[in-house]
């Protein structure tokens, strides 16, 4: 066996138990807890990467995880792991989280083109004009997450599961 | 079009090795993991092991452990199948597989006949 | 390991007979139950994948039913290119486990 069987920190992982999606690609099955952006393949009997599968059909697995790499690649918007959604930073520029500072304060530099409202915001007729509170609050904090079918699971590294049958 | 060509049949002695090729083309070879699996006369298909597409791990079934190996070569698309100390039950077809991701292996090889016999 | 048993083990049929091969598993496998078809000297080719979704390519007389341990492959009209041996695969855990065939002869 090469590459595959070993533990990050060498030691039998406390998350190594049989669990039951409520939904998602497998159900059922026996699962591993996996690293961050990687999902467990029951037939493989391992954590893949998901990048590996975000070019083909079958990425309902990691759907989050892939729709989170294609926004990150489109300029001005972040992905946003609650709302599980594609947020454009201009809809939110004034009230927007730190994924969209650099977006925003370059918009704010320069008021050309800004829509009416952000104009506004920018002469100071809106309050918490730059105040990151609200549904965005600690947005930044979150991780991809490890599993569509357990939204928002983050886990430890010696809580990730590279322990195979 | 996607396709997995195979190296041509063997004859072999019991207790000597062989490896079997499976040269991918139609897709990118380091997308997909690939299965070999096997078939003696008469038999079921079995599960034999495979190899991961980016970084050379490989898993196998515990059956085969010890007197399998998987390689590949990125720069060939190619996948290699080597079996050890044979014997006369080793006597089978082997085929290549590709694994969708989804549960299923969507292309396989033609199969390569290995016969061993004294 | 997950088993599968696949019936009957030979089928004698004639084109244009509705032919129903099943599969059971040891075990619970919800959907993730795939056919295939393998023909003397031809690669095995995916016929089906996920219980009922066919493979690119496969005519719509192929059509597959089943949940949880019991599956069955339905071909509604036979064709000649038809004949063969029907093999099923479990694809929701490691390892992969396979039927023990289902050879289809012409009558």
């Known amino acids: 066996m090469s590459g595959l069987g070993r533990s990050r920190r060498g030691g039998r992982s406390r998350v190594d138990q049989e669990e039951r999606f409520p939904q998602g690609l497998w159900t059922g099955v026996a699962m591993r807890s996996c690293p961050e952006e990687q999902y467990w393949d029951p037939l493989l009997g391992t954590c893949m990467s998901c990048k590996t599968i975000c070019n083909h059909q079958s990425q309902r697995t990691c759907a989050a995880f892939c729709r989170s790499l294609s926004c990150r690649k489109e300029q001005g918007k972040f992905y946003d792991h609650l709302l599980r959604d594609c947020i454009s930073c201009a809809s939110i520029c004034g009230q927007h989280p730190k994924q969209c500072a650099y977006f925003c304060e370059n918009k704010l530099r320069s008021p050309v083109n800004l829509p009416p409202e952000l104009r506004r915001q920018r002469s100071g007729e809106v309050e918490n004009n730059s105040d990151n509170s609200g549904r965005y609050q600690g947005l930044e904090h979150r991780g991809s997450e490890a599993s569509p079918a357990l939204p928002g699971l983050k886990l430890s590294a010696d809580q990730v599961a590279l322990v195979y049958s | 079009q996607v396709q997995l060509v195979q190296s041509g049949a063997e004859v072999k002695k019991p207790g000597a090795s062989v490896k079997v090729s499976c040269k991918a083309s139609?897709?990118?070879?380091?997308?997909?993991?690939m299965h070999w699996v096997r078939q003696a006369p008469g038999q079921r298909l079995e599960w034999m092991g495979y190899i991961l597409p980016y970084n050379d791990g490989t898993k196998y079934s515990q059956k085969f452990q010890g007197r399998v190996t998987i390689t590949r070569d990125t720069s060939a698309s190619t996948a290699y199948m080597e079996l050890s100390s044979l014997r006369s039950e080793d006597t089978a077809v082997y085929y290549c597989?590709?694994?969708?991701?989804?549960?299923?292996?969507?292309?396989w090889g033609q199969g390569t006949t290995v016969t061993v016999s004294s | 390991d997950i088993q599968m048993t696949q019936s009957p083990s030979s089928l004698s049929a004639s084109v244009g007979d509705r032919v129903t091969i099943t599969c059971a598993a040891s075990q619970d496998i919800s959907n993730y139950l795939n056919w295939y078809q393998q023909k003397p000297g031809k690669a095995v080719k995916l016929l089906m994948r996920y219980t009922s979704r066919l493979h690119s390519g496969v005519p719509s007389r192929f059509s597959g039913s089943g949940s949880g341990t019991d599956f069955t492959l339905t071909i509604s009209s036979l064709q000649p290119e038809d004949f063969a041996t029907y093999y099923c695969q479990q694809g929701n855990r490691f390892p992969p486990t396979f039927g023990g065939g289902t050879k289809l002869e012409i009558k």
């Open positions: 139609g897709y990118t070879f380091t997308n997909y993991v």
């Open positions: 597989a590709r694994y969708d991701w989804e549960g299923s292996f969507d292309y």
